[in-house]
């Protein structure tokens, strides 16, 4: 049994880091493998993660961590029974993938303005809470070409757009994702999408 693709990990910079790797053949990850992780810190304890299958030869493990700080560094050991297959390390602050925003809501009752709001996925005491920026994706269910991205570079988790910038009388969907420049993070996953019917009164044309 050998590791074909070494573990790569990302942290949500809160409580979970996710590591993925590939073996050289079909593997029952949960029965055959264990990923050990230990914070490189005074008197830290070692922890065992039981991986799940992620495709035939792929494995994924969700490492539970206490509140992460930028200096944190973990040793990682991948074991098959009593055989050490791979040894490495992981610094969560250098591999951050933020949590996806939640509770995306479209408010359509604001005088021909669409107000999109969502929730910041972090509690106020987390460093990323005040450092997230967002991308909002709006697309038409009827017209694949009608696809747009709005970058929200301010901290407030909301976006206002004129309803008239979208076509009237058709359904749209929206989703939102987050990233943090301070840690040069990757983008989060997209939030679940929400759907609404876009309708607004066309202004009377003057002849």
């Amino acid at each position: 049994m050998k590791v074909l693709q070494e573990p790569t990990c990302v942290s949500d910079y809160m409580s979970i880091s996710t590591c993925e790797w590939k073996m050289n053949g079909p593997t029952n990850c949960s029965t055959e493998l264990r990923l050990l992780y230990q914070l490189v810190f005074l008197l830290s304890e070692a922890h065992t993660c039981i991986p799940e299958n992620n495709g035939g030869a792929g494995c994924v493990c969700h490492l539970l961590m206490d509140d992460v700080v930028s200096a944190d560094n973990y040793t990682l050991d991948l074991w098959a029974g009593q055989q050490l297959l791979w040894k490495g390390s992981f610094k969560p602050s250098e591999h951050v993938k933020p949590r996806a925003p939640g509770n995306l809501t479209v408010h359509t009752n604001v005088s021909d303005t669409l107000l999109l709001t969502w929730s910041n996925p972090y509690p106020p005491d987390n460093y990323l809470y005040n450092h997230l920026t967002y991308a909002v994706n709006i697309w038409s269910e009827n017209d694949p070409a009608d696809f747009r991205i709005y970058n929200v570079t301010y901290l407030e988790p909301s976006l206002r757009i004129a309803a008239s910038t979208l076509k009237s009388g058709i359904s749209y969907r929206a989703r939102v994702r987050a990233w943090a420049q301070c840690y040069n993070t990757t983008w989060s996953e997209w939030s679940p999408s929400t759907k609404w019917h876009n309708s607004y009164r066309e202004p009377f044309e003057q002849h």
Epitope: Q38, V40, L42, L43, A46, D77, W79
Partner: antibody
Framework: EVQLVESGGGLVQPGGSLRLSCAAS????????MSWVRQAPEKRLEWVAI????????YYPDSVKGRFTISRDNAKNSLYLQMNSLRAEDTAVYYC??????????WGQGTTVTVSS | DIQMTQSPSSLSASVGDRVTITCKAS??????LAWYQQKPGKAPKLLIS???SLETGVPSRFSGSGSGRDFTLTISSLQPEDFATYYC?????????FGGGTKVEIK
Amino acid sequence: EVQLVESGGGLVQPGGSLRLSCAASGFTFSSYAMSWVRQAPEKRLEWVAIISGGGDSTYYPDSVKGRFTISRDNAKNSLYLQMNSLRAEDTAVYYCARLHYWYFDFWGQGTTVTVSS
Amino acid sequence: DIQMTQSPSSLSASVGDRVTITCKASEDLYNRLAWYQQKPGKAPKLLISGATSLETGVPSRFSGSGSGRDFTLTISSLQPEDFATYYCQQYWRNPYTFGGGTKVEIK
């Protein structure tokens, strides 16, 4: 070369106090956690106090908690162990040791503490 | 607390002998184990960490093996300066605990 030299051991009566010192050299003292490890006659090695490099975190096993206090002076490259309310079972050789997160990578020669009336 | 049991507690051997010391843990440590050497009146010295990794400056006649609960320290060809007491220590879970020691004496 890393050197750790303990001093301050001796004979003390039960209930008495003693202060051990450890002079460190040959490494950047403030960058390392330090510890006191003891070995009682016919007993196992046992760590009794640990302090972080900056001195802001300290750790004790239940056997000495509330009686022993570890401290350090990074400007003087010195480590200390204040031992109060000493008991006969605290009789041991006390070693100053540098802690590499989880194991002890350099040790001093030890100083003997005898608690007896 | 994790219990560490070393065996034998003492052994007699001659220069050139192959010596094996075992350390058994009360629970699975994977490879979170260190070995120390202590000569009479001297400071203990770290020999091995991670069950198998030799520390810088430690002679290659020393080797560590094992994982899980059973670990071994081997001296391939005993030298006069190797007569000492050897201890194992687990760092899987705090409080980190030591074995009772194995005294290697001259036959």
